[in-house]
Interface confidence: low
């Protein structure tokens, strides 16, 4: 439905508060280095302009597209070339090329200082002094560090952030009330950002068809009582929402997401019995709740899949008439019967089925050719099952920290060219699969584990894409979205790698390690472990364990010493020498 003024349409639909918040997110995700005050100024100018268009949709420039309006505004930033270099060249382009250019310059790992949490009293004072600015600052800081964060969901996080401060700044023990809530928001936020990053990568690198296939599988698991046409409608609408958000069209995205939530709640009888509670909530909570809703119960007495997809004489006829519709039906029927499978496994099965039909429907006897297609699924199902079983056993044996270390060693040996911070970050996240998923019963382990691993490996892929250093990573990341995890799992030690030169500075530690949190101290030790493996890729588990145990003892001893700095200097030299001897460096 065409509107005379798109900016007026979105302002009216979303309301001023959400409009301003979403424009701030959009600008911060594009110009990640700009100071907060500059962004606030731009947002206020856009908002004032939008209000003139609401008053008179025929007013000058009100008929311009949002990309044109926002792009023009971003290109007024005076320091664009000094701050962003070649991104300034985007401003010489016309829409839609200009927006595409801005999108290509989004940085998944911007060079920004780590967010340091101030004292609780300082935060509460800032919150009370100027609540609006305090919350805008939150949106800005998250958006610029996570340029693909799902904008309507960030509004939900900001609402919870505000609620936490409203409640806890009045509490007797402010810190005890606030800090756990902020930790939870931080962890959930990182997870949400990573999940959305995979959706955007799926759309941008593999296309709409890949995203739609993922959505058919996931929604069919979640809504197994909904019929195929209903799932297809939801998939179409969901694809539009995510295409918009991933493309920087945040106002349209938030508006369409609200419409989708409304539709789902109005039609919950034909979608899922689990939506009732979600649909009673306010908009932001409702949308979040629907996105996280548990799988509905499977309908009783679902017939065998073989009848329609193997035994029927019409398989090739139906496939030929509408390939994607027929494959979509297959994926829907398989997924609604298998909430115990990961989405990526379901997509591998659908791909195998498609490949078989492509081959067999051209054969002399198609039915004879595809009759055993379901037998080809068995090894595909067993591979992730076995992998998860082995890794959960290892996790239960080692605990999270040591399990992460095992993965650090494993992945550093596979792809030693990758930067140490990236290997540490990715392996730590891979290791979290244990505490996240191994506690689940068998029926929930695979969807939890393998779909989580897809999200984490995508982090590796997007970080590596920025500065590619390993052909093996590039290959696993680009060949097939659904086979990324099996591709990385199959990598052996990189025999072509030339070990890194030994540098004693890398293994020199100071007393400041003693004041770090347990998590930060772990990261320091894990960084050293990655560096050790890069120096000695053929080191055995036993050798590495001995060195890491010595290292832990060294840190503990020096942190208890009276003269910590001297201890780190003297004992550190001994540790380096002993480690070199132990590893034959």
């Amino acid at each position: 439905d065409a509107h005379k003024s798109e900016v007026a349409h979105r302002f009216k639909d979303l309301g001023e508060e959400n409009f301003k918040a979403l424009v701030l997110i959009a600008f911060a995700q594009y110009l990640q280095q700009c100071p907060f005050e500059d962004h606030v100024k731009l947002v206020n100018e856009v908002t004032e302009f939008a209000k003139t268009c609401v008053a008179d949709e025929s007013a000058e420039n009100c008929d311009k597209s949002l990309h044109t309006l926002f792009g023009d505004k971003l290109c007024t930033v005076a320091t664009l070339r000094e701050t962003y270099g070649e991104m300034a060249d985007c401003c010489a382009k016309q829409e839609p090329e200009r927006n595409e250019c801005f999108l290509q310059h989004k940085d998944d790992n911007p060079n920004l200082p780590r967010l340091v949490r101030p004292e609780v009293d300082v935060m509460c004072t800032a919150f009370h002094d100027n609540e609006e600015t305090f919350l805008k600052k939150y949106l800005y800081e998250i958006a610029r560090r996570h340029p693909y964060f799902y904008a309507p969901e960030l509004l939900f996080f900001a609402k919870r952030y505000k609620a936490a401060f409203t409640e806890c700044c009045q509490a007797a023990d402010k810190a005890a009330c606030l800090l756990p809530k902020l930790d939870e928001l931080r962890d959930e936020g990182k997870a949400s950002s990573a999940k959305q990053r995979l959706k955007c990568a799926s759309l941008q690198k593999f296309g709409e068809r890949a995203f739609k296939a993922w959505a058919v599988a996931r929604l069919s698991q979640r809504f197994p009582k909904a019929e195929f046409a209903e799932v297809s409608k939801l998939v179409t609408d969901l694809t539009k929402v995510h295409t918009e958000c991933c493309h920087g069209d945040l106002l349209e995205c938030a508006d369409d997401r609200a419409d989708l939530a409304k539709y789902i709640c109005e039609n919950q009888d034909s979608i899922s019995s689990k939506l009732k509670e979600c649909c009673e909530k306010p908009l932001l909570e409702k949308s979040h709740c629907i996105a996280e809703v548990e799988n509905d119960e499977m309908p009783a007495d679902l017939p065998s899949l073989a009848a329609d997809f193997v035994e029927s004489k019409d398989v090739c006829k139906n496939y030929a008439e509408a390939k994607d519709v027929f494959l979509g039906m297959f994926l829907y029927e398989y997924a609604r019967r298998h909430p115990d499978y990961s989405v990526v496994l379901l997509l591998r099965l659908a791909k195998t089925y498609e490949t078989t039909l492509e081959k067999c429907c051209a054969a002399a006897d198609p039915h004879e050719c595809y009759a055993k297609v379901f037998d080809e699924f068995k090894p595909l199902v067993e591979e992730p099952q076995n992998l998860i079983k082995q890794n959960c056993e290892l996790f239960e044996q080692l605990g999270e920290y040591k399990f992460q270390n095992a993965l650090l060693v494993r992945y550093t040996k596979k792809v030693p060219q990758v930067s140490t911070p990236t290997l540490v970050e990715v392996s730590r996240n891979l290791g979290k699969v244990g505490s996240k998923c191994c506690k689940h019963p068998e029926a929930k382990r695979m969807p939890c584990a393998e779909d989580y691993l897809s999200v984490v490996l995508n982090q590796l892929c997007v970080l590596h894409e920025k500065t590619p250093v390993s052909d093996r990573v590039t290959k696993c990341c680009t060949e097939s979205l659904v086979n990324r995890r099996p591709c990385f799992s199959a990598l052996e030690v990189d025999e072509t790698y030339v070990p890194k030169e030994f540098n004693a500075e890398t293994f020199t530690f100071h007393a400041d390690i003693c004041t770090l949190s347990e998590k930060e101290r772990q990261i320091k030790k894990q960084t050293a472990l990655v560096e050790l493996v890069k120096h000695k890729p053929k080191a055995t588990k036993e050798q590495l364990k001995a060195v890491m145990d010595d290292f832990a003892a060294f840190v503990e001893k020096c942190c208890k010493a009276d003269d910590k700095e001297t201890c780190f200097a003297e004992e550190g030299k001994k540790l380096v020498a002993a480690s070199q001897a132990a590893l034959g460096l």
Partner: nanobody, 126 residues
Framework: EVQLLESGGGLVQPGGSLRLSCAAS????????VAWFRQAPGKGREFVAG????????YYADSVKGRFTISRDNSKNTLYLQMNSLRPEDTAVYYC???????????????????WGQGTLVTVSS
């Protein structure tokens, strides 16, 4: 916009046959998921049969399977419902419904169809 106009209803004896037609204008019928629904006196709308847009994958309600056949003639931009072995419980107003655009499949959910004809009455009685 899609306009739909049903015809072919009437009075028929049990065991008899009727063929309903639905002429579409404003959009090609082969680009549209189309279906027949019916509404018996005092009851809600019930899905009868459907056919996907661009694909001849057909769907039937269990109560009509083997007796009714849905088809379309793209050159005439018309949808048909061939009804054989009619029973008194088939008495209802029959509606043709269209759902343009992707996904190009039919649905049993009446609310998903934005375009409807005005209906044609089928009475099965001796």
């Amino acid at each position: 916009e899609v306009q739909l106009l049903e015809s072919g209803g009437g009075l028929v004896q049990p065991g008899g046959s009727l063929r309903l037609s639905c002429a579409a204008s404003g959009r090609y019928i082969d680009e549209t998921a189309v279906a027949w629904f019916r509404q018996a006196p005092g009851k809600g709308r019930e899905f009868v049969a459907g056919i996907g847009g661009g694909v001849d994958i057909t769907y039937y309600a269990d109560s009509v399977k083997g007796r009714f056949t849905i088809s379309r003639d793209n050159s005439k931009n018309t949808l048909y419902l061939q009804m054989n072995s009619l029973r008194p419980e088939d008495t209802a107003v029959y509606y043709c419904a269209a759902r343009p655009g992707r996904p190009l499949i039919t649905s049993k959910v009446a609310e998903l169809y934005p375009y409807w004809g005005q209906g044609t009455l089928v009475t099965v009685s001796s």
